[in-house]
Amino acid sequence: LSLEGSRTLTVCPGSVQPLSSQTLRASSSAGTDPQLLLYRVVRGPQLGRLFHAQQDSTGEALVNFTQAEVYAGNILYEHEMPTEPFWEAHDTLELQLSSPPARDVAATLAVAVSFEAACPQRPSHLWKNKGLWVPEGQRAKITMAALDASNLLASVPSPQRLEHDVLFQVTQFPSRGQLLVSEEPLHAGQPHFLQSQLAAGQLVYAHGGGGTQQDGFHFRAHLQGPAGATVAGPQTSEAFAITVRDVNERPPQPQASVPLRITRGSRAPISRAQLSVVDPDSAPGEIEYEVQRAPHNGFLSLVGGGPGPVTHFTQADVDSGRLAFVANGSSVAGVFQLSMSDGASPPLPMSLAVDILPSAIEVQLQAPLEVPQALGRSSLSQQQLRVVSDREEPEAAYRLIQGPKYGHLLVGGRPASAFSQLQIDQGEVVFAFTNFSSSHDHFRVLALARGVNASAVVNITVRALLHVWAGGPWPQGATLRLDPTILDAGELANRTGSVPHFRLLEGPRHGRVVRVPRARTEPGGSQLVEQFTQQDLEDGRLGLEVGRPEGRAPSPTGDSLTLELWAQGVPPAVASLDFATEPYNAARPYSVALLSVPEATRMEAGKPESSTPTGEPGPMASSPVPAVAKGGFLGFLEANMFS
């Protein structure tokens, strides 16, 4: 990797300057795509900030950018005007350039912020040169709010600053009035005044009457050392504008402004809703607007004018629909800082806000809402509802357009059909079952964010409060006891004060659930079971006949039972018992109670009995006794005592 470019950036005070390829240019010997040349900001600027033209200029500091973004002019340095005047200031950015597998390269970008530079954004080289408004035939003080050369003084080291001043030499006097210093008029023989006199409020302009034409004066300002000596240092020649206004003039009154809402990359006319004034003594064409500061999300243009941005326009342009805002690719809201004047009153600041609407939004549903069975309710989170456009939309609002069938949504404990993303994020939006007849539900919402909407369906499932056995494989052809070591809804029983019951929805593919007789004296054999209770499990009355996969040689396989679990006062839940099976191995200790073992095993042990079809468990096993773990051995003996 190599870095070229000057690595210096000159910025006008208070302005935004893009980084360019002249400033910062990286290349690699491999001819890497500029998109893959990544800069990391190790240490950001101190006197301003670095941001991306098409991302939030008010958000967090920029951390990464690419050479391609530099080429596109999208990486901007904005100098933030300090409260204290300065003549020249220096800032640095420490960057690290990387593009694997090449080694990282460190770079420092020097930023010079100077009033010396020629700045199109600010024609004056002084801290302030704002001009003056004076009523016809009257006088007005020229204060440091209007004219201030403190930045020239700031070029002197602070210990010597008190001994210095700024001398203003008037090179062209006002034509319609007089300048006075301490009530003494300035003239060709005495054409000077000092910054210190300005600061003391001693400079006055007195208008001579006889019309409201513009006035002003030209001057040269430079540093003056101790005892009035001229010293080397910054200097400037400029004009100070004086506007004379009619004493009967009523200033224009700005009206409340509605933000312009526009989708990114599009064009929209500015109307009186965005910019209008009430001025009884001016025509719309006389009310002029000047753009003082433009946002980074687009520009103003005039129909019939050039394609580029305009900085001056009139109320007539607005009223006729000639003024338009052209949005660029940025998704960030912005504000135009404008000044408005009727040419006869001091300019008034105005602003025009531009909201960039997403062209589309998407409701992201990362997971269904899982409701714990014993609670019957659950808070929604960003996992269920989150709106994104070209960014996350934290101010999204939601409205139910189709409610849940088996429950309702509550905000703060009361049923609600509308809620916000903030309420979701704070855990205030809850779904609660009110009808306990389904293990699933769903609702449809309409999400609204920045004027755009989208709908989505949130699915709801109930998470069973059931402890399910997870262990080694079960023997094919055997009947094992289904008991609380395998399925246990005891906690649900305790929480609801009821006896949970199960309904078999599906499975097993190979085998069946049966009710086993307590003793040989009970009539009949095993009965097929489709429903049972927690009590049945605890009583050991249930068996699972583990079948063999049909039509192939015995081999390990997977199987499952899908159950619906019900209890009083809570929604039902679907759960599954997944288990692995393998051909029976008499030498293996199985961690479940076996009520019978496969027929073939008994034959091999020298006790021939009538065989049963493959996959159908035979009668209760008698002898030899297979190894059964965890008390299953005693259970096995008990079950077979009378065989």
């Epitope: 609670l375 019957g376 309710r377 409205r399 139910l400 357009i401 189709q402 409610g403 069938k405 309702h408 949504l409 509550l410 703060g412 404990g413 009361r414 049923p415 609600a416 059909s417 509308a418 609660a432 079952f433 009110t434 009808n435 306990f436 609801t496 004060g497 009083q568 006062g569």
Partner: antibody
Framework: QVQLQESGPGLVKPSQTLSLTCTVS?????????WNWIRQHPGKGLEWIGY???????NYNPSLKSRVTISRDTSKNQFSLKLSSVTAADTAVYYC?????WGQGTLVTVSS | DIQMTQSPSSLSASVGDRVTITCRAS??????LNWYQQKPGKAPKLLIY???SLHSGVPSRFSGSGSGTDFTLTISSLQPEDFATYHC?????????FGQGTKVEIK
């Protein structure tokens, strides 16, 4: 705040259908969640009859389900109760209510 | 259906008394309980929702508490305008059900 007002005949003959309407002001019936009908037999407790929701779905008290219909007219911002095959046991003050606010109630007497 | 049982069915108290009314559900209602006040010939008015949340405009002398199946409405200092019948109602499971009411009378 939302205001509710019941209207309908105060006297209904046995075996006929009781019909009441609730007019909602200060809010839309497409935004409030539940729009309920509740009744109170003279000197007795309150009995929930059923509701219609913002999206037009219903739920009824199982004890009355076979005889009840609750519908709505969004253009008029109203919802209605129909209770068929009434008997003297249906004599009560009938209220319409959302979650927070109730109408003042209307007494319906079932008598020939 | 969830049965709601209020106790006592009536009570006599004086102005300034602390009054407690209880409501028991036949099984857990997850806190989804409202309390209403009803005066003769008038419609019920919501006082408390979701066990303990005070409805807007309701004086702070009214408070609610409880969980699971047992809930309480407390009037910290009874005022003349509080003599009325009080009803609890669950909205945890359909059908919504009410208690039979507790009448608070002047002693």
């Amino acid at each position: 705040q939302v205001q509710l007002q019941e209207s309908g005949p105060g006297l209904v003959k046995p075996s006929q259908t009781l019909s009441l309407t609730c007019t909602v002001s200060g809010g839309s019936i497409t935004s409030g969640y539940y729009w309920n009908w509740i009744r109170q037999h003279p000197g007795k407790g309150l009995e929930w009859i059923g509701y219609i929701t913002y999206d037009g779905s219903n739920n009824y008290n199982p004890s009355l389900k076979s005889r009840v219909t609750i519908s709505r007219d969004t253009s008029k911002n109203q919802f209605s109760l129909k209770l068929s095959s009434v008997t003297a046991a249906d004599t009560a003050v009938y209220y319409c209510a959302d979650f927070d606010y109730w109408g003042q109630g209307t007494l319906v007497t079932v008598s020939s | 259906d969830i049965q709601m049982t209020q106790s006592p069915s009536s009570l006599s108290a004086s102005v300034g008394d602390r009054v407690t009314i209880t409501c028991r559900a036949s099984y857990g209602i997850r806190g989804y309980l409202n309390w209403y006040q009803q005066k003769p010939g008038k419609a019920p008015k919501l006082l408390i929702y979701y066990t303990s949340s005070l409805h807007s405009g309701v004086p702070s002398r009214f408070s609610g508490s409880g969980s699971g199946t047992d809930f309480t409405l407390t009037i910290s200092s009874l005022q003349p305008e509080d003599f009325a019948t009080y009803h609890c109602q669950q909205y945890s499971a359909l059908p919504w059900t009410f208690g039979q009411g507790t009448k608070v009378e002047i002693k």
